[in-house]
């Protein structure tokens, strides 16, 4: 079997839709937020895809510190009790309830910075994060639906004569697989793992003698990757002119 050769093409470099992936933080100055994320101020909840192993910074609503009474971060992770981290300005006290993950911390001391950081992001950090700013004028809050993205490992091999198997292993969410050229493909198989990742497998056959090399293209929110492989000869074939 010939080894597949690889072609990495990060979607971050080519896709405007995925600009949030390139940044670890949505905490920009208000002018930037208004320009780049006009919905952010108006929305209470933000869906935010974050790549695993990167660092993420989540920010509170833009409230002046002098107006603050209490800052509370509420963290709801799947299968765990709700964790709260709070800071009372008047007493300069911080308090935590049911918070066991040491990777989720204040960026610095809450009187300096109310942002929350996840360092680094793990697959278990999928969940809902909400900052509540209590002021004399009422409560202001901003919520994040954090979707942790896991880059799949892509493999390509020829399983038997002119049949290739492309796998996108343990991706989150599931990757999509396409082929150049299109082949005679079995239905795509998906295998779901307990940690929320998915392995996608595509198996295709090329009868055409003139197909020299097949390319498996894997599309994923974390980036695209292509692998290609030269197919073995048609069994029994020795010599041919240009064949169609």
């Amino acid at each position: 079997e010939g080894a597949a050769q690889s072609n990495n093409s990060l979607m971050l470099q080519t896709s405007k839709e995925n600009h949030t992936l390139a940044s670890n933080s949505l905490c920009m100055d208000e002018k930037q937020i208004t320009q780049n994320h006009s919905k952010v101020l108006a929305e209470v909840n933000i869906s935010w895809p974050v790549q695993m192993a990167r660092n993420a910074v989540l920010c509170c609503p833009p409230i002046e510190f002098r107006n603050l009474i209490v800052i509370t971060w509420e963290i709801i992770l799947r299968g765990q009790p709700s964790c709260t981290k709070s800071y009372r300005k008047e007493t300069n006290e911080t308090k935590e309830t049911n918070c066991t993950d040491e990777r989720i911390t204040w960026v610095s001391t809450p009187d300096q910075n109310s942002d929350l950081q996840i360092h680094p992001v793990a697959i278990t950090h999928d969940g809902y994060y909400r900052c509540i700013m209590a002021t004399p004028d009422g409560n202001f809050h901003r919520g994040y639906h954090l979707q942790v993205l896991v880059t799949p490992e892509v493999t390509l091999f020829e399983s038997r004569n002119r049949t290739a198997v492309c796998k996108a292993v343990a991706g989150k969410p599931a990757a999509q697989i396409s082929w150049i050229p299109a082949g005679d493909c079995a239905p795509t198989e998906q295998e779901y793992w307990g940690n929320g990742t998915v392995t996608v497998k595509s198996t295709c056959h090329w009868e055409g003698h003139n197909v020299s090399t097949v390319t498996c293209h894997v599309s994923h929110l974390t980036g695209n990757k292509s692998l290609y492989i030269e197919l073995l000869p048609v069994p029994g074939a020795k010599k041919s002119a240009k064949l169609y």
């Epitope: 292509s226 073995l232 000869p233």
Partner: antibody, heavy 114, light 107 residues
């Protein structure tokens, strides 16, 4: 690292044959197609055909059909390209390449002149 | 056969300028390709494999993009040593076919 070492330059008369060799190292010789490409002076690149050493399977471009023969010797990890009935327009540099075109030999100049 | 239409056939550009070369596959047939640089008397050198993968040791000013039938090769800031002829090669179908080449001169 794949290495492809080609035989030296040849001068041939019209009507004669030439056999160019390409010795491979650094990869599993029988598992990769070997291709031949030529380039006439001042011209572009032209694919001639390929051979799969593991089975001896061959594809020739129809332009060279009947005049070209590609063979492989697995004991020495060498492929050969023989071109017969040479004419002046066959004067070119002949390249062998493998690993889906990512590894090339340095080329062999074949001059056909009376 | 898949014909690869490469354009332009030649261009003369100043150092520091951006250079773009395109290759289009005939018959609307999706393919995969490589981009090569060739200097006089030398074998072609692979710069970009599989449409967009920069080969080891190749300066980052070179890039490739595109998929399906339309592909682009770019030099972001031309250097004097980039004077050469550039070729695309489709390797999806037999026969493999090259573009006609683009001769790049420095003004």
């Amino acid at each position: 690292q794949v290495q492809l070492v080609q035989s030296g330059a040849e001068v041939k008369k019209p009507g004669a044959s030439v056999k160019v060799s390409c010795k491979a190292s650094g990869h599993t010789f029988t598992s990769y197609w070997m291709h031949w490409v030529r380039q006439a002076p001042g011209q572009g690149l032209e694919w001639m055909g390929n051979i799969y050493p593991g089975s001896g399977s061959i594809n020739y471009d129809e332009k060279f059909q009947g005049r070209v023969t590609m063979t492989a010797d697995t004991s020495t990890s060498t492929v050969y390209m023989e071109l017969s009935s040479l004419r002046s327009e066959d004067t070119a540099v002949y390249y062998c390449l493998t690993m889906t075109g990512t590894s090339w030999g340095r080329g062999t100049l074949v001059t056909v002149s009376s | 056969d898949i014909q690869m239409t490469q354009s332009p056939s030649s261009l003369s550009v100043s150092v520091g300028d951006r250079v773009t070369i395109t290759c289009q596959a005939s018959q609307g047939t999706p393919i995969n390709l490589h981009w090569f640089q060739q200097k006089p008397g030398k074998a072609p050198k692979l710069l970009i494999s599989g449409a967009s993968n920069l080969e080891d040791g190749v300066p980052s000013r070179f890039s490739g993009s595109g998929s399906g039938t339309e592909f682009t090769f770019t030099i972001s800031s031309l250097q004097p040593e980039d004077a050469a002829t550039y070729y695309c090669l489709q390797f999806t179908y037999i026969p493999w076919t090259f573009g006609q080449g683009t001769k790049l001169e420095i003004k």
